[in-house]
Interface confidence: low
């Protein structure tokens, strides 16, 4: 909120836009303001908190020759590899005299193919000995439905049917491969293929 002798008009003439994309995306948010006199430092907020280590650049252009003339200030925040922790509401913040001004918000969202948090691992088992395999994936978007495959053959009729995060295998009599498909509204991601080697009896 403003903190000065009066609630002056906001200096922001350009507010951050919105970015929605998949993990790893690179994007830039931009704020523009017009101020009289010495240009202020532009801070970036995510969900109301100042970003201490923001990858931001600031450029300022005088609109006249006098120090007290107006300046155009542009701050750009670079998001180099979009992660879930980057999502939220972004705003620019400046201190002018004894006042604090915050821009209108822009939003960064994450939406793409499922991302694996856990994938099935290779292992060696004795013949006909039970074991478990794990697979875990997340969006957004949610929900994420899993489909297990054994030797490239689906173990359920559809994603979300049958085992999900943990697959119980009652036993094998020959070396087999297992993988996991993660399905969401954006598409399908396939996990690594785990080779389960069966020791001869």
């Amino acid at each position: 909120a403003p903190r000065g002798t009066q609630a002056e008009e906001s200096p922001f003439v350009g507010n951050p836009g919105n970015i929605t994309g998949a993990r790893g995306l690179t994007g830039t948010l931009r704020c523009q303001l017009q101020v009289q006199g010495e240009p202020p430092e532009v801070h970036w907020l995510r969900d109301g908190q100042i970003l201490e280590l923001a990858d931001s650049t600031q450029t300022q252009v005088p609109l006249g020759e006098d120090e007290q003339d107006d300046w155009i200030v542009v701050s750009q925040l670079r998001i180099t590899s979009l992660q879930l922790s980057d999502t939220g509401q972004y705003q620019c913040l400046v201190f002018l005299g004894h006042q604090t001004f915050v821009s209108q918000p822009g939003y960064v969202g994450l939406e793409g193919l499922p991302y694996f948090l856990e994938e099935p691992e290779d292992r060696t088992v004795a013949a006909n000995t039970p074991f478990n395999l794990s697979c875990q994936a997340q969006g957004p978007p949610e929900p994420v439905d899993l489909l297990w495959l054994q030797d490239a053959v689906p173990l359920a009729t559809a994603p979300g049917h049958g085992p999900q995060r943990s697959l119980h295998v009652p036993g094998l009599n020959k070396t087999s491969s297992f993988s996991c498909e993660a399905h969401n509204a954006k598409g399908v991601t396939t996990s690594r293929t785990a080779t389960i080697t069966v020791l001869p009896q």
């Epitope: 909120a1 403003p2 903190r3 000065g4 002798t5 009066q6 609630a7 008009e9 906001s10 801070h43 907020l45 969900d47 109301g48 908190q49 100042i50 201490e52 509401q89 705003q91 913040l93 201190f95 005299g97 004894h98 604090t100 001004f101 915050v102």
Partner: antibody, heavy 118, light 112 residues
Amino acid sequence: QVQLQQPGAELVKPGASVKLSCKASGYTFTSYWINWVKQRPGQGLEWIGNIYPDSSSTNYNEKFKSKATLTVDKSSTTAYIQFSSLTSEDSAVYYCTRDTYGGSPDYWGQGTTLTVSS
Amino acid sequence: DIVMSQSPSSLAVSAGEKVTMSCKSSQSLLNSRTRKIYLAWYQQKPGQSPKLLIYWASTRQSGVPDRFTGSGSGTDFTLTISSVQAEDLAVYYCKQSYNLWTFGGGTKLEIK
């Protein structure tokens, strides 16, 4: 996490001066205004003034301009309020509070109880 | 200076009842450019520091129960507690930050 630490109590004699502290931690001290608020026993809240640590810019409630002085020490991330010519009217709880930017949590110290008594 | 007036100064209600309290400012707290109203509501429980409930007149602070609602525009504002709980025993203050800070005198809420 953000913390504003204030001494629990101070006892001073009438006519003396006192300097109360507010030690900030868990955030960039220079980026947020620190406000000071007075509360007399059983009474409401009164805003004294504020200070922006980066530049030491201050604003004061006219009522407290000749009574209180706000300062900061950036190296120790501590804000101070100094009172002069103390009287019993200055006996109160004094809170320091970090400014908020829409949607961020507000943080208050626990308050220092100042007692002015001979 | 902006003067903030609160009413009533105290009220007693039974748990589960709806309660409203009023805050009036001596001038408009609306910034026409940012379209924000610089009016906040605080709750102060006995022996504790004040806690922010509502900012920008009607935006609930994160973690505040949704039984607390702020409303109003210009110079007249209201804090409503839709169903008072025993833990809501406190003094409630409005505060303007349009021009520095000024607090209202407070409304003491007691539970019957």
